[in-house]
Amino acid sequence: EKAMVDGSWLDLAKRSKLEAQPFAHLTINATDIPSGSHKVSLSSWYHDRGWAKISNMTFSNGKLIVNQDGFYYLYANICFRHHETSGDLATEYLQLMVYVTKTSIKIPSSHTLMKGGSTKYWSGNSEFHFYSINVGGFFKLRSGEEISIEVSNPSLLDPDQDATYFGAFKVRDID
Protein backbone atom coordinates (compact mmCIF):
# COMPACT_ATOMS: atom_id res chain seq x y z
CA GLU A 1 0.00 0.00 0.00
CA LYS A 2 2.88 2.35 0.88
CA ALA A 3 4.51 1.60 -2.50
CA MET A 4 1.26 2.43 -4.22
CA VAL A 5 0.96 5.72 -2.36
CA ASP A 6 4.60 6.55 -3.19
CA GLY A 7 4.01 5.66 -6.85
CA SER A 8 0.90 7.78 -7.22
CA TRP A 9 2.65 10.65 -5.40
CA LEU A 10 5.50 10.37 -7.90
CA ASP A 11 3.03 10.39 -10.81
CA LEU A 12 1.34 13.48 -9.39
CA ALA A 13 4.66 15.25 -8.92
CA LYS A 14 5.70 14.37 -12.48
CA ARG A 15 2.35 15.47 -13.85
CA SER A 16 2.36 18.80 -12.00
CA LYS A 17 5.92 19.46 -13.17
CA LEU A 18 4.85 18.74 -16.76
CA GLU A 19 1.81 20.95 -16.38
CA ALA A 20 4.07 23.73 -15.13
CA GLN A 21 6.33 23.42 -18.20
CA PRO A 22 5.99 26.70 -20.11
CA PHE A 23 4.68 26.61 -23.66
CA ALA A 24 2.95 28.86 -26.15
CA HIS A 25 1.43 28.47 -29.58
CA LEU A 26 0.30 31.81 -31.06
CA THR A 27 -1.69 32.24 -34.26
CA ILE A 28 -1.96 35.34 -36.41
CA ASN A 29 -4.79 37.79 -35.75
CA ALA A 30 -6.01 38.32 -39.29
CA THR A 31 -8.05 41.40 -38.40
CA ASP A 32 -4.94 43.33 -37.47
CA ILE A 33 -2.19 42.54 -39.97
CA PRO A 34 -0.03 45.64 -40.43
CA SER A 35 0.60 47.19 -43.82
CA GLY A 36 3.94 47.84 -45.42
CA SER A 37 6.21 46.39 -48.06
CA HIS A 38 9.37 46.31 -45.93
CA LYS A 39 10.20 44.51 -42.68
CA VAL A 40 7.51 45.06 -40.05
CA SER A 41 6.86 43.63 -36.62
CA LEU A 42 3.78 41.42 -36.22
CA SER A 43 2.24 42.39 -32.92
CA SER A 44 -1.28 40.97 -33.08
CA TRP A 45 -1.52 37.27 -32.26
CA TYR A 46 -4.16 35.05 -30.67
CA HIS A 47 -3.18 33.10 -27.57
CA ASP A 48 -6.50 31.60 -26.49
CA ARG A 49 -8.64 30.71 -29.48
CA GLY A 50 -8.61 27.90 -32.03
CA TRP A 51 -5.22 26.18 -31.98
CA ALA A 52 -3.66 28.98 -29.93
CA LYS A 53 -2.72 28.21 -26.31
CA ILE A 54 -0.36 29.60 -23.69
CA SER A 55 0.78 28.36 -20.28
CA ASN A 56 3.36 29.80 -17.89
CA MET A 57 4.47 32.31 -20.46
CA THR A 58 3.06 35.80 -21.08
CA PHE A 59 1.88 37.46 -24.26
CA SER A 60 2.02 41.24 -24.06
CA ASN A 61 2.41 44.10 -26.57
CA GLY A 62 2.91 41.68 -29.43
CA LYS A 63 5.75 39.83 -27.70
CA LEU A 64 6.03 36.41 -26.10
CA ILE A 65 7.62 36.89 -22.68
CA VAL A 66 9.63 34.17 -20.93
CA ASN A 67 8.67 33.67 -17.26
CA GLN A 68 11.08 30.84 -16.43
CA ASP A 69 14.77 30.42 -17.26
CA GLY A 70 15.44 27.39 -19.40
CA PHE A 71 16.30 25.87 -22.74
CA TYR A 72 13.40 26.38 -25.15
CA TYR A 73 12.53 25.13 -28.57
CA LEU A 74 11.30 28.11 -30.63
CA TYR A 75 9.49 27.75 -33.94
CA ALA A 76 7.72 29.90 -36.49
CA ASN A 77 5.73 29.09 -39.60
CA ILE A 78 4.86 31.91 -41.98
CA CYS A 79 2.86 31.50 -45.18
CA PHE A 80 2.67 34.10 -47.92
CA ARG A 81 0.07 33.93 -50.65
CA HIS A 82 -1.53 35.98 -53.38
CA HIS A 83 -4.60 35.29 -55.49
CA GLU A 84 -5.49 37.42 -58.48
CA THR A 85 -8.98 38.12 -57.11
CA SER A 86 -7.40 40.55 -54.62
CA GLY A 87 -5.69 42.54 -57.38
CA ASP A 88 -2.24 42.57 -58.95
CA LEU A 89 1.20 42.58 -57.41
CA ALA A 90 2.83 45.94 -57.97
CA THR A 91 6.16 44.15 -58.33
CA GLU A 92 6.78 40.54 -59.34
CA TYR A 93 10.15 40.27 -57.58
CA LEU A 94 9.63 39.73 -53.87
CA GLN A 95 11.75 39.11 -50.82
CA LEU A 96 9.62 36.99 -48.49
CA MET A 97 11.28 36.75 -45.08
CA VAL A 98 10.66 36.01 -41.41
CA TYR A 99 12.87 37.05 -38.49
CA VAL A 100 12.53 35.65 -34.97
CA THR A 101 14.01 38.17 -32.55
CA LYS A 102 14.96 38.06 -28.86
CA THR A 103 14.86 41.28 -26.88
CA SER A 104 16.41 41.55 -23.46
CA ILE A 105 15.05 44.25 -21.15
CA LYS A 106 17.66 43.91 -18.38
CA ILE A 107 20.58 44.52 -20.71
CA PRO A 108 18.80 46.44 -23.50
CA SER A 109 19.67 44.47 -26.62
CA SER A 110 18.02 42.74 -29.52
CA HIS A 111 19.23 39.69 -31.43
CA THR A 112 17.88 37.86 -34.45
CA LEU A 113 17.72 34.23 -33.33
CA MET A 114 16.46 32.82 -36.61
CA LYS A 115 15.64 34.03 -40.07
CA GLY A 116 14.30 32.30 -43.12
CA GLY A 117 12.88 33.05 -46.52
CA SER A 118 13.71 33.56 -50.13
CA THR A 119 13.55 35.95 -53.04
CA LYS A 120 10.68 34.99 -55.31
CA TYR A 121 9.47 35.80 -58.79
CA TRP A 122 5.70 35.72 -58.70
CA SER A 123 4.65 36.14 -62.31
CA GLY A 124 1.54 38.14 -63.09
CA ASN A 125 0.53 35.36 -65.48
CA SER A 126 -0.28 33.00 -62.61
CA GLU A 127 -3.62 33.03 -60.83
CA PHE A 128 -2.24 31.93 -57.45
CA HIS A 129 1.09 32.03 -55.60
CA PHE A 130 2.09 30.44 -52.31
CA TYR A 131 5.27 30.22 -50.25
CA SER A 132 5.84 28.83 -46.76
CA ILE A 133 8.74 29.38 -44.34
CA ASN A 134 9.38 27.23 -41.28
CA VAL A 135 12.19 27.94 -38.83
CA GLY A 136 12.93 26.27 -35.52
CA GLY A 137 15.77 26.15 -33.02
CA PHE A 138 16.92 25.46 -29.46
CA PHE A 139 17.81 28.48 -27.31
CA LYS A 140 18.74 29.37 -23.77
CA LEU A 141 16.24 31.96 -22.58
CA ARG A 142 16.08 33.94 -19.34
CA SER A 143 13.04 35.18 -17.47
CA GLY A 144 11.94 38.56 -18.82
CA GLU A 145 13.32 38.03 -22.31
CA GLU A 146 10.89 38.66 -25.15
CA ILE A 147 10.39 36.90 -28.46
CA SER A 148 8.90 38.74 -31.43
CA ILE A 149 8.31 38.10 -35.12
CA GLU A 150 9.09 40.36 -38.05
CA VAL A 151 8.17 39.71 -41.66
CA SER A 152 8.53 41.37 -45.03
CA ASN A 153 5.47 42.11 -47.17
CA PRO A 154 2.80 41.54 -44.48
CA SER A 155 0.02 42.30 -46.97
CA LEU A 156 0.77 38.88 -48.50
CA LEU A 157 0.47 36.93 -45.23
CA ASP A 158 -1.87 33.95 -45.20
CA PRO A 159 -4.22 34.78 -42.31
CA ASP A 160 -5.25 31.21 -41.45
CA GLN A 161 -4.35 29.77 -38.04
CA ASP A 162 -2.75 26.73 -39.66
CA ALA A 163 -0.58 28.92 -41.88
CA THR A 164 0.94 31.74 -39.84
CA TYR A 165 1.93 30.98 -36.26
CA PHE A 166 4.84 30.82 -33.84
CA GLY A 167 5.52 29.25 -30.48
CA ALA A 168 7.89 27.98 -27.85
CA PHE A 169 8.13 25.24 -25.27
CA LYS A 170 10.60 24.65 -22.47
CA VAL A 171 12.65 21.52 -22.93
CA ARG A 172 14.86 21.57 -19.81
CA ASP A 173 16.14 23.71 -16.97
CA ILE A 174 19.43 25.55 -17.08
CA ASP A 175 21.84 23.51 -14.93
Epitope: S35, G36, S37, T85, G87, L89, A90, T91
Partner: antibody, heavy 126, light 103 residues
Protein backbone atom coordinates in the same frame (compact mmCIF):
# COMPACT_ATOMS: atom_id res chain seq x y z
CA UNK B 1 -7.36 67.83 -52.73
CA UNK B 2 -6.58 64.96 -55.08
CA UNK B 3 -7.06 65.83 -58.75
CA UNK B 4 -6.32 64.12 -62.05
CA UNK B 5 -6.40 66.48 -65.04
CA UNK B 6 -6.30 65.00 -68.54
CA UNK B 7 -5.27 66.50 -71.86
CA UNK B 8 -7.87 67.70 -74.36
CA UNK B 9 -9.87 65.93 -77.06
CA UNK B 10 -8.02 64.45 -80.04
CA UNK B 11 -9.00 63.48 -83.59
CA UNK B 12 -6.90 60.91 -85.43
CA UNK B 13 -6.98 59.02 -88.71
CA UNK B 14 -6.98 55.21 -88.72
CA UNK B 15 -3.46 53.80 -88.37
CA UNK B 16 -2.21 56.85 -86.43
CA UNK B 17 -1.25 57.07 -82.73
CA UNK B 18 -2.56 59.15 -79.86
CA UNK B 19 -0.92 60.08 -76.55
CA UNK B 20 -3.11 61.17 -73.63
CA UNK B 21 -1.67 62.76 -70.50
CA UNK B 22 -2.93 62.69 -66.92
CA UNK B 23 -1.48 65.21 -64.46
CA UNK B 24 -1.87 64.34 -60.78
CA UNK B 25 -1.89 66.76 -57.86
CA UNK B 26 -2.80 66.74 -54.17
CA UNK B 27 -0.94 63.52 -53.25
CA UNK B 28 2.45 61.83 -53.56
CA UNK B 29 2.31 60.65 -57.17
CA UNK B 30 5.02 57.97 -56.70
CA UNK B 31 3.07 56.13 -54.00
CA UNK B 32 0.16 55.04 -56.19
CA UNK B 33 -0.65 53.26 -59.43
CA UNK B 34 -2.52 54.92 -62.28
CA UNK B 35 -4.99 52.92 -64.38
CA UNK B 36 -6.31 53.69 -67.85
CA UNK B 37 -9.95 52.86 -68.58
CA UNK B 38 -11.97 53.69 -71.68
CA UNK B 39 -15.61 53.82 -72.69
CA UNK B 40 -16.64 53.54 -76.34
CA UNK B 41 -20.08 54.91 -77.28
CA UNK B 42 -22.82 52.67 -75.91
CA UNK B 43 -20.28 50.25 -74.41
CA UNK B 44 -19.30 49.27 -70.89
CA UNK B 45 -16.18 50.63 -69.21
CA UNK B 46 -13.09 48.74 -70.32
CA UNK B 47 -9.84 48.45 -68.34
CA UNK B 48 -6.72 48.97 -70.46
CA UNK B 49 -3.72 48.86 -68.15
CA UNK B 50 -1.90 50.27 -65.15
CA UNK B 51 1.45 51.78 -64.25
CA UNK B 52 3.03 51.73 -60.80
CA UNK B 53 4.13 55.37 -60.64
CA UNK B 54 6.86 54.51 -58.14
CA UNK B 55 8.84 51.91 -60.08
CA UNK B 56 7.36 52.21 -63.58
CA UNK B 57 6.06 48.61 -63.67
CA UNK B 58 3.15 48.15 -66.04
CA UNK B 59 0.41 45.64 -66.79
CA UNK B 60 -1.92 45.69 -69.78
CA UNK B 61 -5.10 44.04 -70.92
CA UNK B 62 -4.38 41.26 -73.43
CA UNK B 63 -6.63 43.11 -75.87
CA UNK B 64 -4.24 46.09 -76.09
CA UNK B 65 -0.93 44.24 -75.70
CA UNK B 66 1.52 45.43 -78.35
CA UNK B 67 -0.49 48.57 -79.17
CA UNK B 68 -0.33 50.37 -75.85
CA UNK B 69 2.48 52.09 -73.97
CA UNK B 70 2.03 53.67 -70.55
CA UNK B 71 4.79 55.82 -69.09
CA UNK B 72 5.16 58.34 -66.29
CA UNK B 73 7.20 61.41 -65.46
CA UNK B 74 7.53 61.49 -61.67
CA UNK B 75 9.03 64.99 -61.66
CA UNK B 76 5.95 66.28 -63.48
CA UNK B 77 3.53 63.93 -61.59
CA UNK B 78 2.11 62.94 -64.96
CA UNK B 79 1.16 59.61 -66.52
CA UNK B 80 0.88 59.08 -70.27
CA UNK B 81 -1.00 56.52 -72.33
CA UNK B 82 -0.12 56.04 -75.97
CA UNK B 83 -2.29 53.89 -78.24
CA UNK B 84 -0.97 53.00 -81.69
CA UNK B 85 -2.46 51.65 -84.93
CA UNK B 86 -5.77 53.30 -84.19
CA UNK B 87 -8.97 52.00 -85.75
CA UNK B 88 -12.50 53.40 -85.73
CA UNK B 89 -13.52 51.15 -82.84
CA UNK B 90 -10.93 52.94 -80.65
CA UNK B 91 -13.20 56.00 -80.67
CA UNK B 92 -13.94 56.40 -76.97
CA UNK B 93 -13.57 58.53 -73.88
CA UNK B 94 -10.27 57.61 -72.20
CA UNK B 95 -9.96 58.00 -68.44
CA UNK B 96 -7.05 57.82 -66.05
CA UNK B 97 -7.85 56.74 -62.49
CA UNK B 98 -5.82 56.40 -59.32
CA UNK B 99 -5.66 53.05 -57.55
CA UNK B 100 -6.68 53.40 -53.93
CA UNK B 101 -3.75 51.26 -52.67
CA UNK B 102 -0.79 53.19 -51.29
CA UNK B 103 2.36 51.36 -52.44
CA UNK B 104 4.18 52.40 -49.24
CA UNK B 105 1.67 50.40 -47.21
CA UNK B 106 1.58 47.30 -49.38
CA UNK B 107 2.27 45.88 -52.78
CA UNK B 108 -1.16 44.93 -54.07
CA UNK B 109 -2.79 47.03 -56.76
CA UNK B 110 -6.37 46.59 -55.62
CA UNK B 111 -8.35 48.03 -58.56
CA UNK B 112 -10.38 50.44 -56.42
CA UNK B 113 -10.35 53.56 -58.59
CA UNK B 114 -10.84 56.29 -55.99
CA UNK B 115 -10.08 59.36 -58.15
CA UNK B 116 -10.65 59.76 -61.89
CA UNK B 117 -9.66 62.23 -64.57
CA UNK B 118 -12.39 64.11 -66.43
CA UNK B 119 -11.88 61.97 -69.54
CA UNK B 120 -10.37 62.62 -72.97
CA UNK B 121 -12.45 62.02 -76.07
CA UNK B 122 -10.42 60.38 -78.84
CA UNK B 123 -12.16 60.23 -82.21
CA UNK B 124 -10.73 57.97 -84.91
CA UNK B 125 -12.15 58.83 -88.30
CA UNK B 126 -10.93 58.96 -91.87
CA UNK C 1 -11.57 35.58 -67.39
CA UNK C 2 -14.26 36.68 -64.94
CA UNK C 3 -17.42 38.17 -66.47
CA UNK C 4 -19.63 40.64 -64.57
CA UNK C 5 -23.35 40.75 -65.39
CA UNK C 6 -25.63 43.51 -64.13
CA UNK C 7 -29.42 43.62 -63.95
CA UNK C 8 -31.54 45.40 -64.85
CA UNK C 9 -29.88 47.23 -67.74
CA UNK C 10 -32.13 50.22 -67.06
CA UNK C 11 -34.78 51.22 -64.58
CA UNK C 12 -37.16 54.08 -63.94
CA UNK C 13 -38.17 55.03 -60.40
CA UNK C 14 -39.73 57.90 -58.50
CA UNK C 15 -37.92 60.29 -56.17
CA UNK C 16 -37.83 58.69 -52.71
CA UNK C 17 -38.05 55.12 -54.04
CA UNK C 18 -35.73 52.36 -52.91
CA UNK C 19 -33.67 51.19 -55.87
CA UNK C 20 -31.71 47.92 -56.07
CA UNK C 21 -29.19 46.94 -58.74
CA UNK C 22 -27.76 43.40 -58.90
CA UNK C 23 -24.34 42.31 -60.10
CA UNK C 24 -23.28 38.70 -60.66
CA UNK C 25 -19.75 37.41 -61.18
CA UNK C 26 -19.11 34.33 -63.31
CA UNK C 27 -17.16 32.83 -60.37
CA UNK C 28 -16.59 33.62 -56.70
CA UNK C 29 -14.73 36.89 -56.12
CA UNK C 30 -15.02 36.95 -52.31
CA UNK C 31 -15.85 40.59 -51.49
CA UNK C 32 -13.64 42.22 -54.13
CA UNK C 33 -16.38 44.23 -55.79
CA UNK C 34 -16.74 47.99 -56.38
CA UNK C 35 -19.56 50.23 -57.59
CA UNK C 36 -19.20 53.43 -59.64
CA UNK C 37 -21.53 56.21 -60.73
CA UNK C 38 -21.14 57.74 -64.20
CA UNK C 39 -22.78 60.95 -65.34
CA UNK C 40 -22.33 62.25 -68.91
CA UNK C 41 -19.39 64.63 -69.23
CA UNK C 42 -18.26 64.06 -65.63
CA UNK C 43 -15.53 62.00 -64.03
CA UNK C 44 -16.73 58.60 -62.76
CA UNK C 45 -17.18 58.36 -59.01
CA UNK C 46 -16.35 55.45 -56.69
CA UNK C 47 -19.36 54.77 -54.45
CA UNK C 48 -18.69 51.44 -52.77
CA UNK C 49 -15.53 49.34 -52.49
CA UNK C 50 -14.95 45.90 -51.03
CA UNK C 51 -18.66 45.06 -51.63
CA UNK C 52 -19.98 47.17 -48.73
CA UNK C 53 -17.55 49.94 -47.70
CA UNK C 54 -18.86 53.42 -48.43
CA UNK C 55 -16.29 55.65 -50.09
CA UNK C 56 -15.58 58.87 -48.20
CA UNK C 57 -17.95 61.70 -49.18
CA UNK C 58 -20.61 59.42 -50.67
CA UNK C 59 -24.13 59.92 -49.23
CA UNK C 60 -25.28 57.23 -46.81
CA UNK C 61 -28.36 56.44 -48.94
CA UNK C 62 -25.96 54.33 -51.05
CA UNK C 63 -25.12 50.91 -49.66
CA UNK C 64 -23.61 47.69 -50.97
CA UNK C 65 -23.95 44.08 -49.91
CA UNK C 66 -23.10 40.57 -51.03
CA UNK C 67 -20.15 38.22 -51.27
CA UNK C 68 -19.04 35.31 -53.42
CA UNK C 69 -20.70 35.84 -56.78
CA UNK C 70 -23.83 37.92 -56.08
CA UNK C 71 -23.85 41.59 -55.05
CA UNK C 72 -26.31 44.44 -54.77
CA UNK C 73 -26.16 48.22 -54.77
CA UNK C 74 -29.06 49.89 -53.00
CA UNK C 75 -30.15 53.52 -53.10
CA UNK C 76 -32.47 53.78 -50.08
CA UNK C 77 -34.24 56.95 -51.23
CA UNK C 78 -33.67 57.98 -54.84
CA UNK C 79 -32.78 61.64 -55.36
CA UNK C 80 -32.84 63.64 -58.64
CA UNK C 81 -29.02 63.92 -58.56
CA UNK C 82 -28.77 60.10 -58.60
CA UNK C 83 -29.76 59.99 -62.29
CA UNK C 84 -26.72 58.25 -63.78
CA UNK C 85 -25.39 54.93 -65.05
CA UNK C 86 -24.06 52.59 -62.37
CA UNK C 87 -21.31 50.04 -62.95
CA UNK C 88 -20.06 47.16 -60.84
CA UNK C 89 -16.41 46.19 -61.20
CA UNK C 90 -14.07 43.42 -60.12
CA UNK C 91 -10.40 44.07 -60.93
CA UNK C 92 -10.24 44.22 -64.75
CA UNK C 93 -13.91 43.42 -65.43
CA UNK C 94 -16.86 45.82 -65.43
CA UNK C 95 -20.56 45.09 -65.62
CA UNK C 96 -22.48 46.41 -68.62
CA UNK C 97 -24.07 49.19 -66.57
CA UNK C 98 -27.51 50.06 -65.22
CA UNK C 99 -29.09 53.32 -66.34
CA UNK C 100 -31.23 54.90 -63.62
CA UNK C 101 -33.91 57.40 -64.62
CA UNK C 102 -36.59 59.35 -62.75
CA UNK C 103 -40.25 58.58 -63.56
Amino acid sequence: QVQLVQSGAEVRKPGASVKVSCKASGYDFSNYAIHWVRQAPGQRLEWMGWINAGNGNTKFSQKFQGRITVTRDTAASTAYMELRSLRSEDTAVYYCARDHSNMVRGIIIAYYFDYWGQGTLVTVSS
Amino acid sequence: EIVMTQSPSSLSASVGDRVTITCRASQSISRYLNWYQLKPGKAPRLLIYGASSLQSGVPSRFSGSGSGAEFTLTISSLQPEDIATYYCQHTRAFGQGTKVEIK
